[in-house]
């Protein structure tokens, strides 16, 4: 039931899961100079019953130098087998997450965890794509990918997303180009690290847009 491959890579885009299906494993990874405590689990597992899902086990790391010091931190990368990277930041705002039935939320960060989290996804998992800072989405279809089982093999569906430089035309018919950044605020510095899986309504073909107008307004 584990997905064999990583989700597809989209140029100038990152992906993220907003919730993790039961059965998902998260490797306990530690940042450089730290390692997983000897008695610690090598991974966290999303488990649940009909009403509640949660992560089993806790990742803990200890300093590689001071062996006695136990800290609530992630495990070491060297013990990984298949690395499934979600290109996500561990500092995501947990309050922003939706509770999806049969899914676990993003586990809270632990002290000294690695900068990259490595998940082992299961069939039925959805990941969402967003263009990185400096690029805009060309609206061509679903900006998401689902791990599916087909003829006994797992595969990820192809997200219909193209990310283009902001200087290139990328609007739908009728969409207005914004004059400035909304509210006059600078772009979030964290956004370039984050793969916020934005789930947008998809447009499969621009041709279907003829009778629909996009307006981009900044109040």
């Amino acid at each position: 039931e584990l997905c064999d491959d990583d989700p597809p890579k989209i140029t100038h885009a990152t992906f993220k899961a907003v919730a993790y299906k039961e059965g998902t494993m998260l490797n306990c990874e530690c940042k450089r100079g730290f390692r997983r405590i000897k008695s610690g689990s090598p991974y966290m597992l999303c488990t649940g019953n009909s009403s509640h899902s949660s992560w089993d086990n806790q990742c803990q790391c200890t300093s590689s130098a001071a062996r006695n010091t136990t800290k609530q931190v992630t495990p070491q990368p060297e013990e990984q087998k298949e690395r499934k990277t979600t290109e996500m930041q561990s500092q995501m705002q947990l309050a922003d997450q939706v509770s999806l039935p049969g899914h676990c939320r993003e586990p809270p960060p632990w002290e000294n965890e690695a900068t990259e989290r490595i998940y082992h996804f299961v069939v039925g998992q959805t990941v969402y794509y967003q263009c990185v800072q400096g690029y805009r989405a060309l609206h061509r279809g679903p900006a998401e990918s689902v791990c599916k089982m087909t003829h006994g093999k797992t595969r990820w569906t192809q997200p219909q997303l193209i990310c283009t430089g902001e200087t290139e035309p990328s609007q739908f018919p009728g969409e207005e180009e914004p004059q400035a950044s909304p509210d006059g605020l600078p772009e979030s510095e964290t956004s370039r690290l984050v793969t916020t899986t934005d789930f947008r309504i998809q447009t499969e073909v621009a041709a279907t847009m003829e009778t629909f107008i996009f307006t981009t307004e900044y109040q």
Epitope: K16, R136, E166, P182, S191, Q202, F212, F214
Partner: antibody, heavy 130, light 107 residues
Framework: QVQLVQSGAEVKKPGASVKVSCKAS????????IHWVRQAPGQGLEWLGI????????IYAQKFQGRVTMTRDTSTTTVDMELSSLRSEDTAVYYC???????????????????????WGQGSTVTVSS | EIVLTQSPATLSLSPGERATLSCRAS??????LAWYQQKPGQAPRLLIY???NRATGIPARFSGSGSGTDFTLTISSLEPEDFAVYYC?????????FGQGTKVEIK
Amino acid sequence: QVQLVQSGAEVKKPGASVKVSCKASGYTFNSYYIHWVRQAPGQGLEWLGIINPTGGRTIYAQKFQGRVTMTRDTSTTTVDMELSSLRSEDTAVYYCARVPGYCKDTSCQDFYYYYGMDVWGQGSTVTVSS
Amino acid sequence: EIVLTQSPATLSLSPGERATLSCRASQSVSSYLAWYQQKPGQAPRLLIYDASNRATGIPARFSGSGSGTDFTLTISSLEPEDFAVYYCQQRSNWPPTFGQGTKVEIK
């Protein structure tokens, strides 16, 4: 608890404007986009538009283009929908509904959401009559 | 825009019976279809998202299936509180659109 509380019923004359408010509470305001949907008496659901509370970007249905304006106030976690040049066929119950979005940068150009409209306001009745 | 056509317009059934509601899209919406329940004087309530996933707090008697253009909402055994109007809605293309609704009434 999570809720969307809408403003009260309005009676308007043809040609006038109406503003319906939707006050969000119990969740992170910027993390959810707000849809506006209306329902004429005895009819089905009709989509008017959507607003991203971060930055205030909007997308309107073509049918209402030029007549509808959606705004938000992050300090009061309120979203407003104003419909102008009212006609009798605008008589309906107007609903706000949230969907979780992950495009939260103020500079964001994408308009993604997932899941579904999981929390709805109680509805605001707008009657247009001369 | 994508047109969603629901059938039948009205379904007359008794409590305990199985209800099967259909929603057909004018073009493929992949699995990006939701089902809502609406009772008189109330706002709609999300039942199913992405064709087959039950929303939080929705009883197991509600199930969704289908992909592409043909979708089904099944209520395995009708409870008295299930008599209502049901709408499908797609999020595959702008603008999001709703079906015209199926009324499930007591026979």
